[in-house]
């Protein structure tokens, strides 16, 4: 069954945390639907963004942070692991210097950390996706 | 009630149609969240666009046309008359040389006819709203 | 064994221009973010800019945004602040540090750093 | 004025307990790295990402961090521990800043 879009979550992230979500884009890419992660400060959708990834189907993932209510310098990636039409599986790892984004068990993009990972209260999925799946693992200490 | 985002539906427009729409974003505008409506010549998705809507609540509205399965030049404007977190009414009226867009009863953008509007065979209403109104009306014969 | 030699420091007058040089070697060079910082006489550490290690990102502290600009050539191994519309604060010795990180990140360490280099602002 | 305030001078007998603050960041969010520098040479890292040592540096050397302080410990001061300390952290995390410095005396 489908989880409602923008889905919000509370969440705690560390070192070892991975955020995993599944779903599929709502268009074509000829049509350039996105997907959007946030990883927020605070539980309100205006927080500060420790960690923003936005999926422009078909074309490009640009990376950022939202600081003070500003854009930090944007990070862009070219990769386009998604496929047209197709479910697609991404998951986050908090590792030690840096995020790491794999899509569909490869490892596609990486961002490093700018801010604190424990900073993170509040994880947000948007845009024009269907949602199957979000699920927050915790590393067992 | 809610309609289904994306929504489509199969339309026929001439000078003297109107389209009304009426929704919400789903997001704050310092989030960016779009809107965006699309008049197609075929029913499928991936079909050329005869007039490209596009908002992004807070900054700009961008428009076009996609020929041939290109996008053309396009037309942006920063008009912004859409207001944070408030409903909003847009009506697309053909006129005769042009569309002619308002936002909650204003004229607000104007976009010159590329195509005929009778090549207009759907139209999509997308991206991050939630939307309560959809009509077309047609000029009586 | 790793080293970072700055080069280019002197005497200016005010409003005019001078041109740094870090020289690094012992290290992979085009793997780590470079920072800039300076030390004015008998004062503390004052940061001044920072380079990604691909040198696209790009940072400056508020006492030098839009006089000063941070450059890098990794095939050069270098590392450049081209300073312009100098002014006697701007009196110090100049560092070049090395990152931990590839990318600027406040507070994550710079773990080597140069001897340093003087600029004086004077007429 | 620095954005981050350090104590200009903290004493310590040799053997002892040194502990430098470091107030007025916002320590929840961005990470904090501590320098020492002696008198005519560069600054050499002794703590970074709050509580992280780069290798080579002494395990009486501590940091931590906890709202809008950050904290570095010398556990058993010894004499050549006599040096200035600077705290540095970020006012965003692409722009970095030093606190005042503290002198550090070992008695």
């Known amino acids: 069954s489908l989880l409602p879009v923008p889905y919000t979550e509370a969440a705690s992230l560390s070192t070892g945390s991975t955020v995993t979500i599944k779903g599929r884009p709502l268009a074509c890419f000829l049509n350039e639907p996105y997907l959007q992660v946030d990883f927020h400060t605070e539980m309100k959708e205006e927080s500060d963004i420790v960690f923003h990834f936005q999926v422009c189907f078909g074309r490009r993932v640009v990376m950022n942070s939202r600081e003070y209510g500003a854009w930090k310098q944007q990070v862009e990636s070219k990769n386009m692991p998604f496929q047209d039409g197709q479910e697609f599986e991404l998951s986050i790892s908090v590792l030690p210097d840096k995020y790491q984004v794999m899509v569909n068990g490869q490892s596609s993009y990486t961002f490093d950390h700018r801010i604190k990972p424990e900073a993170v209260k509040m994880v947000q999925v948007w845009r024009d996706i269907s949602l199957t799946k979000f699920n927050v693992s915790y590393l067992k200490r | 009630s809610l309609l289904p985002v994306p929504y489509t539906e199969a339309a026929s427009l001439s000078t003297g149609s109107t389209v009304t729409i009426k929704g919400r974003p789903l997001a704050c505008f310092l989030n960016e969240p779009y809107l965006q409506v699309d008049f197609h010549t075929e029913m499928k998705e991936e079909s050329d666009i005869v007039f490209h809507f596009q908002v992004c609540f807070g900054r700009r509205v961008v428009m076009n046309s996609r020929e041939y399965g290109a996008w053309k030049q396009q037309v942006e404007s920063k008009n912004m008359p859409f207001q944070d977190g408030q409903e909003f009414e847009l009506s697309i009226s053909v006129l005769p040389d042009k569309y002619q867009v308002m936002v909650n009863g204003q004229s607000s953008y104007t976009f010159d006819h590329r195509i005929k509007p009778e090549a207009v065979k759907m139209v999509q209403v997308w991206r991050d709203i939630s939307l309560t109104k959809f009509n077309v009306s047609y000029l009586k014969r | 064994e790793l080293q970072l030699v700055e080069s280019g420091g002197g005497l200016v007058q005010p409003g005019g221009s001078l041109r740094l040089s870090c020289s690094a070697s012992?290290?992979?060079?085009?793997?780590?973010?470079m920072n800039w910082v300076r030390q004015a006489p008998g004062k503390g550490l004052e940061w001044v800019s920072g380079?990604?290690?691909?040198?696209?990102?790009?940072s400056y502290g508020e006492s030098v945004k839009g006089r000063f600009t941070i450059s890098r050539d990794n095939a050069k191994n270098t590392l450049y602040l081209q300073m312009n519309r100098l002014n006697p604060d701007d009196t110090a010795v100049y560092y070049c540090?090395?990152?931990?990180?590839?990318?600027?990140?406040?507070?994550?360490?710079?773990?080597?750093w140069g001897q340093g280099t003087q600029v004086t602002v004077s007429s | 004025s620095s954005a981050l305030t350090q104590p200009s001078a903290v004493s310590v007998s040799l053997g002892q307990t040194a502990r430098i603050t470091c107030q007025g960041g916002?320590?929840?969010?961005?990470?904090v790295s501590w320098y020492q520098q002696k008198p005519g040479q560069a600054p050499v890292l002794v703590i970074y990402?709050?509580?992280e040592r780069p290798s080579g540096i002494p395990e009486r050397f501590s940091g931590s961090s906890s709202g809008d302080t950050a904290t570095l410990t010398i556990s058993g001061a010894q004499a050549e521990d006599e040096a200035d300390y600077y705290c540095?952290?970020?006012?965003?995390?692409?722009?970095?800043?030093f606190g005042g410095g503290t002198h550090l005396t070992v008695l």
């Open positions: 540095q952290s970020g006012s965003s995390s692409d722009n970095a800043v």
């Open positions: 540090a090395k990152s931990k990180r590839g990318a600027v990140v406040a507070g994550t360490g710079d773990d080597y």
């Open positions: 916002n320590f929840g969010r961005y990470y």
């Open positions: 380079v990604n290690s691909g040198g696209g990102l790009t």
């Open positions: 012992g290290f992979t060079f085009g793997a780590y973010a």
């Open positions: 990402k709050d509580s």
